[in-house]
């Protein structure tokens, strides 16, 4: 009986072994097939051959003090994705802004030549004819147009004729509004920061919002105007003129924006000089916004050559006056504050000059001259508090002009002389103009470039005009790098585990099965 019993148990064991091995074999086979398919699918979708079709775009920023040409590049197949456009070149045109050519329009063609030729070199010849070129003029031309629509139109007409001579697809030159300048700057920085990309979990199709998706506000400072743009907490606005609605990548944004014409750093300085010379007792202006020992002669006719100084205009008993620097930050700050009329506000809250400003919300990117000036002063670090910035400005402005010239020998004196004023003006504008505080100062990030692209309105302008920002979220969201790595590792592990179990099953002695039964 014992032998029979042993035989029966051996048979049972053999049957179990056969049954288990068949099932396990099926499971392992199925698992490995799934893992291989998954690896191939993830690998192929993520690493499909890069599209050869690269597109280019050119935007000229015709600012009040100079013109810059930007060249952008992106893969054609991905033009509706977020963050795929990047800047490949910036060319600064030699000379002043185009509005200064009003009396010499015939020189505009030569003025633009170098940078347009540079674009010809950078962009492959085969792409020239399909590369759009846009020129946007900002506050310098807005001021010229205030003087005469014809004069502004004549300048743009010559610009258009000059740009049409190049082999690119010229799309026109126009004066953009202050609202557009603010809005496109906001779009640019949020596009580059990836704020419009609604990331999807690898196991879910539903986009989820994270705190990271809160957009940044945009602070732009030019020579003739300054813009503030952000999404306020309260969606209802007291001032419809300052409200913009966008639908970008499937999400609605209610944006506040305002452009302060005449409050760019150059025009603000002209305003301050025109204001201060009114009370000067003679043709010497002792100016706290310039370094001690600094001297410069200013023509009264130049002072009144801008619409921005009209409110301070008066007959002076001299044709010229001399600025004599005394380098006092506190006095300079006080003088600058007089440019902001804060006594009148027809809303619940204003910035200055009776312009509505909702409570500040979130982080802000401060770019263009905000960045250039603060970067020169070495004050762009996130760790530098507002109090520290003020201390540094006090120290900088009080430094003698001769010392400053020696310390910054490579910098043009015209620019070097104005950093004390510009830094003071930036602090005054942000703190008293826009109501940032010592606490909210840490929410201001001084930004020059984001992933190699300049922060500014030009990228946003091109994205809009080339219809590269869809209203709705594109259907297929590509995997993020981390999700891709996770999936590749996961399915590779599955394959490895399957292989190990397979080896164990088919290469282990019979006691392995005994233990299992």
């Amino acid at each position: 009986m014992k032998g029979t019993k042993d035989l029966t148990s051996q048979q049972k064991e053999s049957n179990v072994k056969t049954f288990c091995s068949k099932n396990i074999l099926a499971i392992l086979g199925f698992s490995s097939i799934i893992a291989v398919i998954a690896l191939l699918a993830v690998g192929l979708t993520q690493n499909k051959a890069l599209p050869e079709n690269i597109k280019y775009g050119i935007v000229l920023d015709a600012g009040s003090s100079h013109t810059s040409l930007y060249i952008y590049k992106w893969p054609a197949e991905k033009e509706n994705d977020t963050g795929v456009v990047h800047q490949v070149e910036e060319c600064r045109v030699k000379g002043p802004g185009i509005s200064k050519y009003v009396q010499k329009v015939n020189e505009i063609g030569i003025y633009l030549t170098d940078c347009m030729e540079r674009a010809r070199e950078v962009i492959p010849r085969s792409q020239h004819q399909e590369t759009p070129v846009y020129l946007g003029a900002t506050a310098g031309m807005r001021l010229l147009r205030m003087e005469s629509e014809e004069l502004a139109d004549r300048v743009l007409d010559v610009v258009e004729r000059s740009l049409s001579n190049y082999p690119f697809d010229f799309q026109g030159a126009r004066i953009i509004t202050g609202q557009e300048e603010g809005a496109y700057g906001w779009i640019t920085i949020n596009y580059l920061l990836g704020k419009f990309s609604q990331k999807t979990r690898w196991f879910s199709i539903v986009p989820y919002e994270t705190n990271n998706q809160e957009t940044f506000g945009a602070l732009d400072l030019g020579g003739a105007s300054t813009q503030i743009t952000f999404v306020p907490q309260n969606q209802t606005t007291e001032s419809p003129d300052n409200a913009l609605q966008f639908r970008l990548y499937g999400k609605d944004y209610n944006v506040y924006t305002h452009s302060f014409l005449c409050y760019g750093k150059d025009q603000a300085l002209w305003q301050k000089l025109a204001k201060d010379i009114q009370v000067a007792s003679n043709e010497i202006l002792r100016d706290p916004c310039f370094h001690p020992g600094y001297k410069k002669v200013v023509n009264v006719s130049d002072l009144y050559k801008t619409p921005c100084t009209k409110r301070f205009e008066m007959t002076l008993p001299f044709q010229q006056f001399e600025i004599q620097g005394i380098g006092n930050y506190q006095q300079c700050h006080q003088s600058v504050l007089e440019l902001f009329n804060t006594s009148y506000c027809p809303y619940s809250q204003c910035a200055f000059n009776g312009i509505f400003l909702p409570p500040l919300q979130g982080d802000f990117g401060a770019f263009s001259a905000f960045y250039f000036v603060m970067n020169f002063l070495n004050l762009t670090s996130e760790k530098v508090s507002q109090e520290k910035v003020t201390e540094m400005m006090k120290k900088f402005c009080s430094q003698p002009w001769e010392e400053i010239k020696t310390s910054y020998a490579g910098v043009k004196e015209k620019y070097l002389s104005e950093y004390c004023f510009s830094g003071t003006y930036i602090l005054s504008l942000l703190l008293q103009g826009y109501h940032f505080t010592a606490d909210s100062w840490e929410h201001i990030h001084f930004i020059g470039k984001i992933q190699g692209s300049d922060a500014g309105w030009t990228l946003g302008y091109m994205l809009n005009l080339t219809n590269m920002i869809p209203a709705e979220q594109p259907l297929s969201t590509p995997l993020s790098h981390s999700t891709y790595v996770f999936l590749m590792v996961l399915f590779s592990l599955v394959l490895v585990i399957v292989a190990i179990i397979g080896l164990l099953i088919f290469h282990k002695p019979s006691y392995f099965w005994k233990d299992m039964v």
Epitope: M146, E149, L151, A152, R154, S301
Partner: antibody, heavy 123, light 105 residues
């Protein structure tokens, strides 16, 4: 009410100089471009010189370039035309004229004209 | 210089419609303006930027055109409209047409 009153005209010998003045009232003078336009007896209108509101653009007709100088004193609401090396062909009625505006933008058309001042260049 | 050409004279009866033309030697966009001058008076602005009626000007006056060809229309003409009409361009430094003398029959 917008008013432009010219003065300083008269009879002058060829080669001599004369300075015309125009006193403006009834509007914010420094917000507007100003011009001198002349009309020879029995003839058409000829633009002479322009001075934009913020002096960004000062321009002259080829016939007077180098001889005439336009200027303005905003605090005194006054426009001037300094005429030198006068010729017989400069004989005309000289109008002080204000630039118009297209909404918020300046325009090179002429919306208000003074009565004119006569300049006669003769020996 | 941009030369503006006008027909020298026109004679119409009161109540009729009259069109005064002005042709520019080169395109001036819409920067064409019209003035009326009566004997012994300074010119008076009628139309600015091709088609905009100046303030205080009767709606009988209208302007049209762009580029090189422009028209001032008076409909209907009244006895008081006897005057010389000048066109002026401002695309380049200002120039005037020689004027069209409108007489009533």
């Amino acid at each position: 009410e917008v008013q432009l009153v010219e003065s300083g005209g008269g009879l002058v010998q060829p080669g001599r100089s004369l300075k015309l003045s125009c006193l403006a009232s009834g509007f914010t003078f420094n917000n507007y471009g100003m011009n001198w336009i002349r009309q020879a007896p029995g003839k058409g209108l000829e633009w002479v010189a322009s001075f934009s509101s913020s002096s960004t653009y000062i321009s002259y007709a080829d016939t007077v370039k180098g001889r005439f100088t336009i200027s303005r004193e905003n605090a005194k609401n006054t426009l001037y035309l300094q005429m030198t090396s006068l010729r017989s062909e400069d004989t005309a009625l000289y109008y002080c004229v204000r630039h118009g505006r297209y909404g918020g933008y300046g325009g090179f058309y002429f919306d208000y004209w003074g009565q004119g001042v006569m300049v006669t260049v003769s020996s | 210089d941009t030369v503006l050409t006008q027909s020298p004279a026109l004679a119409v009866s009161p109540g009729e419609r009259v069109s005064i033309s002005c042709r520019a030697s080169e395109g001036v966009k819409s920067y064409m303006h019209w003035y009326q001058q009566k004997p012994g008076q300074q010119p008076k602005l009628l139309i600015y930027k091709a088609s905009n009626l100046a303030s205080g000007v009767p709606a009988r006056f209208s302007g049209s055109g762009s580029g090189t060809d422009f028209t001032l229309t008076i409909d209907p003409v009244e006895a008081d409209d006897t005057a010389t009409y000048f066109c002026q361009q401002s695309w380049n430094d200002p120039t005037f047409g020689a004027g069209t003398k409108l007489e009533l029959k």
